[in-house]
Interface confidence: medium
């Protein structure tokens, strides 16, 4: 690496992947193994993130960019840059402090993560239930009751007072 010649800050010429080494007369030195600098002009290199345990490596660390982690099967990422791994549940469940719990009646979750959401209340839109909801699927709303043929009936399930996993009012 060439000695920098900047009249202002000699370190400003050090490119990403290097650091300005004060111990070597401000020469641009390459980042040591398991470290990186993503911008130029840095006086130190940052330690690479290590993807251990429930984390697995999605992208290896390079001299210019940090490692990126994701989660092992059965877990999913939460937080910026996958800072946490959270357990997957089955569709029809949500994760609570006590583990995976089935969605309460009147709610559903069509994902392996997230919260149980209330079934659509078809009557609020002037419609009737065409297909009943399940723990895994929302109800399907059909035509308004007035549009149904005589004798047909439909029952719209009540929406829960709140979604499970959250404090009541």
């Amino acid at each position: 690496f060439e000695r920098t010649r900047s009249l202002q800050d000699p370190c400003s010429n050090c490119p990403a992947g290097t650091f300005c080494d004060n111990n070597r007369n401000q020469i641009c030195s390459p980042c040591p193994p398991n470290s990186f600098s993503s911008a130029g002009g840095q006086r130190t290199c940052d330690i690479c993130r290590q993807c251990k345990g429930v984390f697995r490596t999605r992208k290896e660390c390079s001299s210019t960019s940090n490692a990126e982690c994701d989660c092992t099967p059965g877990f999913h990422c939460l937080g910026a840059g996958c800072s946490m791994c959270e357990q997957d549940c089955k569709q029809g469940q949500e994760l609570t402090k006590k583990g995976c719990k089935d969605c309460c009646f009147g709610t559903f979750n069509d994902q392996k993560r997230g919260i149980c959401r209330p079934w659509t209340n078809c009557s609020l839109d002037g419609k009737s239930v065409l297909v009943n909801g399940t723990k895994e699927r929302d109800v399907v709303c059909g035509p308004s009751p007035a549009d149904l043929s005589p004798g047909a009936s439909s029952v719209t399930p009540p929406a829960p007072a709140r979604e499970p996993g959250h404090s009541p009012q």
Epitope: C77, D110, W119, L124
Partner: antibody
Framework: QVQLVQSGTEVKKPGASVKVSCKAS????????IHWVRQAPGQGLEWMGW????????NYAQKFQGRVTMTRDTSISTAYMELSRLRSDDTAVYYC???????????????WGQGTLVTVSS | QSALTQPPSASGSPGQSVTISCTGT?????????VSWYQQHPGKAPKLMIY???NRPSGVSNRFSGSKSGNTASLTISGLQAEDEADYYC???????????FGTGTKVTVL
């Protein structure tokens, strides 16, 4: 970091259709619903619907049912919103936003795209 | 599903507090604790300020606080600052097929 990048400005004639894209990065695209919200000039925010990128399942606001279609392409982490039979009062900025939750609670739409201006004019 | 009702405007001097109300129904604000508040500066996308009625995302000043009573939610901005001048929208999860509903919006002016 989480980013939602939307397609550029569109000018359409009444009766035409428009398709707006929203490319997600910085998080697991299939893990969180995507909302579509619009805002007419000088007006408030109006929810249009959302899509579950994992299953493709959708919920549309009643006002837009029959005219809006939300789709996604998980291979490129992109959600789409197509609005048909455009009228002049569909002129608005259209936003996509991520529906977020974590162990601390349910955030609703947290990160938003920069918005796409759709102008409908003859 | 109609929009949640907010006052069109609110104002206060620097350092004062201002409170914005957001009135819904028993199918939205009254039914769930899923009320959020957004700040929007002209020409910008909305920014989440409060979620789950009263929680602040990281990075949002503790001058912003939220509460709820019955079908009405409120946002209070204390110690008003010039940069708080913006439009504010409440929003709530709903049980109709229109799953999410926004408020009519309130323009906050710092005098």
């Amino acid at each position: 970091q989480v980013q939602l990048v939307q397609s550029g400005t569109e000018v359409k004639k009444p009766g035409a259709s428009v398709k707006v894209s929203c490319k997600a990065s910085g998080y697991t695209f299939t893990g969180y619903y995507i909302h579509w919200v619009r805002q007419a000039p000088g007006q408030g925010l109006e929810w249009m619907g959302w899509i579950n990128p994992n299953s493709g399942g959708t919920n549309y606001a009643q006002k837009f049912q029959g005219r809006v279609t939300m789709t996604r392409d998980t291979s490129i982490s992109t959600a789409y919103m197509e609005l048909s039979r455009l009228r002049s009062d569909d002129t608005a900025v259209y936003y996509c936003a991520r529906d977020y939750y974590d162990s601390s609670g349910y955030f609703g739409p947290d990160y938003w795209g920069q918005g796409t201006l759709v102008t409908v004019s003859s | 599903q109609s929009a949640l009702t907010q006052p069109p405007s609110a104002s206060g001097s620097p350092g004062q507090s201002v409170t914005i109300s957001c009135t819904g129904t028993s199918s939205d604000v009254g039914a769930y604790n899923f009320v959020s508040w957004y700040q929007q500066h002209p020409g910008k996308a909305p920014k989440l300020m409060i979620y789950d009625v009263s929680n602040r995302p990281s990075g949002v000043s503790n001058r912003f606080s939220g509460s709820k009573s019955g079908n009405t939610a409120s946002l209070t901005i204390s110690g008003l600052q010039a940069e708080d001048e913006a439009d504010y929208y409440c929003s709530s999860y709903t049980s109709s097929s229109t799953r999410w509903v926004f408020g009519t919006g309130t323009k906050v002016t710092v005098l």
